[in-house]
């Protein structure tokens, strides 16, 4: 027998569309070889109507599709506006339509159910509106209108003109009739039920010149759309419930094992705590859509998720609802990255951060996730060189390593910079991660001074200490700017008493600047690294000042005096709010901090090169 | 929580038919199939067949070794499902399990189903 494996009979009814799941072992030549749907005919043969190879028949052109999903071994055969004439004997197979592996299967597309002649099918989603239409003739336009159920041989009145309401539908539906001249009154009925399912009957007007007319309200359960995620990346859940809830508070919710559904985020400030840092409800459209984009996806994750609003922002029947079923991939094209990178006080961090590698031209950005009301991600610094002011001097965005890697580094480290921050790119959303910043107890490895002052014309020479743990690391001096940090000429200078226990592996790397110029105003990292990975950093900021005294300076950190106070975020920053995440150009309009200039002039010596044994952290 | 309560089982002789109904309470936001398991006496549980559901379109999943002989059935207004048995054959005595659940993957898999019913005995004399 065949060990692929699908539906033996599906049904439906005209104008429907369906969705063939088939499954097959999902060995490697499986996962890659042509997958086909086709329709036996009466000579035995099998005529391909679609494949995974892009082959659409003519018959289907524009309503099916098949979809691979090959980490599954599941192939999918959707097909749409179905017609009484599509009912026959298929197959769905991997291979040779002839001699592959296959499944027989029975389509049965039926007329439907019988209805009286006339009527108006109305076809909406549980929770949604519908207004059903009510024509009428001049002679009956003062009589009474009404809107009655038919409930199998009888006719249960619903609503009518002179003001009754059953109490099955009270609060969510009203009779319109309109103004002279118009022949037609509407029923509009909001928050649909599946109760509501059933055929209708409008009459305006009583005796024998009554007017009739049916209506069948067909109310479906939305099926949930199936989402297939990667470990570790993204997703994002777009809801559109409709103009009628577009000022009710909104909701994502996933349902557990007792059927009824946890918030994971509403629009009234309620999070899961399994989602902090990592999940933002983004601001709603004027036609009441939004979106909750969750990152950093663990297999836990998994599960059947909800959308939709209600004023408590929790599930409620007979309210509008959006579903998705999420499957989370564990055989994930996105590499494993720190989740938690910890730095201390005065230290610094580096951070990598994954792109898809078929993107590199992409635009790179760090935003700051924060959780307050629907959480937002204010950017921080971007590649194209654009840094938010409180982070000038400390921060940068570095392509390097590259290839589906690159890094940010944060540096002068507080208490205030603990927590969750997003990479994320302009391109493939599905690529978006975060990582938590955390400070823990210890002192940074790498010792500068905290301010320098230089004398314009003079030589200036700045120290940087690093214990012998970092004797084999490539060490560098680089001046900072909002556009990166451009590596300066160093000079190793052999031991340093910085580090009493070090002995003489500890050792002191030395910027020069000579001479001091106007342009040699800035911030100055000192920093280690392996290649292109990036571990630790130190920051200086050097003042210039006119010429007092003669000679030159050599600044030890015993004489540094406290680093300058950060500039505060001016209040004309706008904040880039959660939308700025789905369309990354927008955070163009975050305020520009001014470029500090060329990089300085200054006399190249020898630079230690090294290997690095850890990545980010100040301290192990 | 969503309970399933079976019945329809009993004895019956080899080549009869029986019908087993499974009937379906309480909330089931997450309910688009139902289908039926047997476990005969110190073998596994085993798929035996399942309906899915979106609208009014029908999917029904068979075992190869009841094609042909069983069919499942459903009624969406009383939430029950129908398995009608027959040509009963001596090796289709077993508890049968209803199960229901999301069933978005692979029906013949147990863990698509969130719910279990207690089970009916069906034995097949020869």
């Known amino acids: 027998k065949s060990p692929v494996f699908g539906p033996q009979e599906v049904s439906s009814v005209e104008g429907n569309s369906v969705s063939i799941k088939c499954y097959y072992p999902p060995t490697s030549v499986n996962r890659h070889t042509r997958k086909y749907w086709c329709r036996k005919g009466a000579s035995g043969r099998c005529i391909t109507l679609v494949s995974s190879e892009g082959y659409v028949s003519s018959n289907y052109a524009g309503r099916a599709n098949l979809t691979n999903f090959p980490e599954n071994g599941t192939f999918v055969v959707n097909i749409a506006q179905l017609s009484r004439d599509d009912s026959g004997h298929y197959k769905c197979g991997l291979g040779i339509n002839s001699r592959g592996l296959s499944f027989d299967v029975s389509l049965e597309v039926s007329q439907g159910p019988e209805l009286p002649n006339g009527t108006e099918v109305y076809t909406v989603d549980v929770g949604r509106t519908v207004t059903i239409k009510c024509p009428f003739k001049t002679e009956n336009a003062p009589k009474t209108k009404a809107l009655y159920k038919k409930i199998g041989q009888t006719s249960v009145l619903v609503i009518d003109s002179r003001n009754y309401v059953n109490p099955n539908y009270k609060d969510r539906i009203r009779l319109r009739i309109p103004g002279t001249g118009q022949l037609i009154f509407t029923v509009v009925i909001d928050r649909l039920r599946l109760s509501d399912h059933g055929l209708y009957l409008c009459q305006a007007g009583d005796g024998s010149n009554r007017d009739e007319k049916n209506a069948d309200l067909q109310v479906l359960e939305p099926e949930p759309e199936l989402v297939y995620e990667d470990l570790r990346g993204s997703v994002t859940f777009h809801c559109a419930l409709g103009l009628e809830v577009a000022n009710v508070a909104k909701f994502l919710c996933r349902v557990n094992s007792r059927e009824t559904c946890d918030v994971v985020i509403n629009t009234l400030g309620k999070r899961d705590s399994a989602f902090e840092g990592r999940i933002l409800l983004n601001p709603q459209d004027k036609d009441g859509s939004f979106s909750v984009v969750i990152t950093g996806l663990r297999k836990e994750d998994e599960g059947r998720y909800l959308c939709g609003a209600h004023s408590d922002g929790q599930l409620q029947e007979g309210w509008p609802i959006q579903a998705w079923q999420l499957f989370v991939n564990e055989e994930s094209t996105i590499p494993r990255s720190p989740t938690v990178v910890k730095g201390v006080a005065g230290g610094s961090v580096a951070v990598l951060c994954p792109y898809n590698p078929k993107e590199s031209q992409s635009l790179k950005y760090w935003c700051l996730w924060e959780g307050a009301q629907n959480g937002r991600c204010p950017l921080l610094v971007e590649s194209q060189g654009l840094v938010q002011e409180q982070y000038e001097g400390r921060l940068s965005l570095l392509q390097e390593p590259g290839n589906g890697t690159f890094t940010v580094i944060l540096n002068q480290l507080t208490t205030q910079d603990a927590g969750f921050y997003w990479c994320l790119t302009n391109g493939d959303t599905r690529w978006r991660t975060t990582v938590e910043i955390k400070i823990i107890e210890g002192e940074p490895n790498l010792k500068v001074p905290g301010n320098v002052t230089a004398v314009l014309g003079e030589t200036l020479n700045i120290p940087c200490h690093f214990p012998c743990k970092f004797s084999s690391y490539e060490k560098y001096w680089c001046k900072w700017s909002n556009t990166g940090c451009q590596t300066l000429p160093s000079q190793d200078e052999g031991p340093s008493e910085a580090f009493v226990n070090c002995d003489e592996n500890s050792r002191l790397v030395s910027l020069t600047l000579n001479p001091v110029t106007r342009a040699d105003e800035g911030w100055y990292w000192c920093g280690v690294k392996q290649g292109h990975f990036y571990g630790e950093t130190a920051a200086v900021y050097v003042a210039v000042e006119e010429k007092k005294v003669a000679g030159s300076r050599y600044v030890s950190p015993a004489k540094a005096d406290a680093a300058p106070d950060e500039k505060v975020l001016d209040s004309g920053v706008r904040e880039i709010e959660n939308k700025a995440i789905q369309d990354p150009r927008l955070f163009a309009e975050e305020k520009v901090v001014a470029d500090t200039g060329d990089q300085a002039g200054g006399s190249r010596a020898s630079v230690d090169s090294s290997s690095s044994e850890e990545q980010g952290g100040s301290s192990k | 929580e969503v309970q399933l309560v079976e019945s329809g089982g009993g004895l019956v002789q080899a080549g009869d038919s029986l019908r087993l109904s499974c009937a379906a309470s309480?909330?089931?936001?997450?309910?688009?199939?139902m289908g039926w398991f047997r476990q005969a006496p110190g073998k596994e549980r085993e798929f035996v067949a399942t309906?899915?559901?979106?609208?009014?379109?029908?999917?029904?999943y068979y075992a190869d070794s009841v094609k042909g002989r069983f069919t499942i059935s459903r009624d969406n207004a009383k939430n029950t499902v129908y398995l009608q048995m027959n040509s009963l054959k001596p090796e289709d005595t077993a508890v049968y399990y209803c199960?229901?659940?999301?069933?978005?993957?692979?029906?013949?898999?147990?863990?698509?189903?969130?719910?279990w019913g207690q089970g009916t005995l069906v034995t097949v004399s020869s």
């Open positions: 199960a229901a659940g999301t069933v978005l993957g692979d029906p013949r898999v147990l863990n698509e189903y969130d719910y």
């Open positions: 309480g909330r089931t936001l997450t309910t688009y199939g």
């Open positions: 309906i899915k559901w979106s609208g009014s379109t029908n999917y029904k």
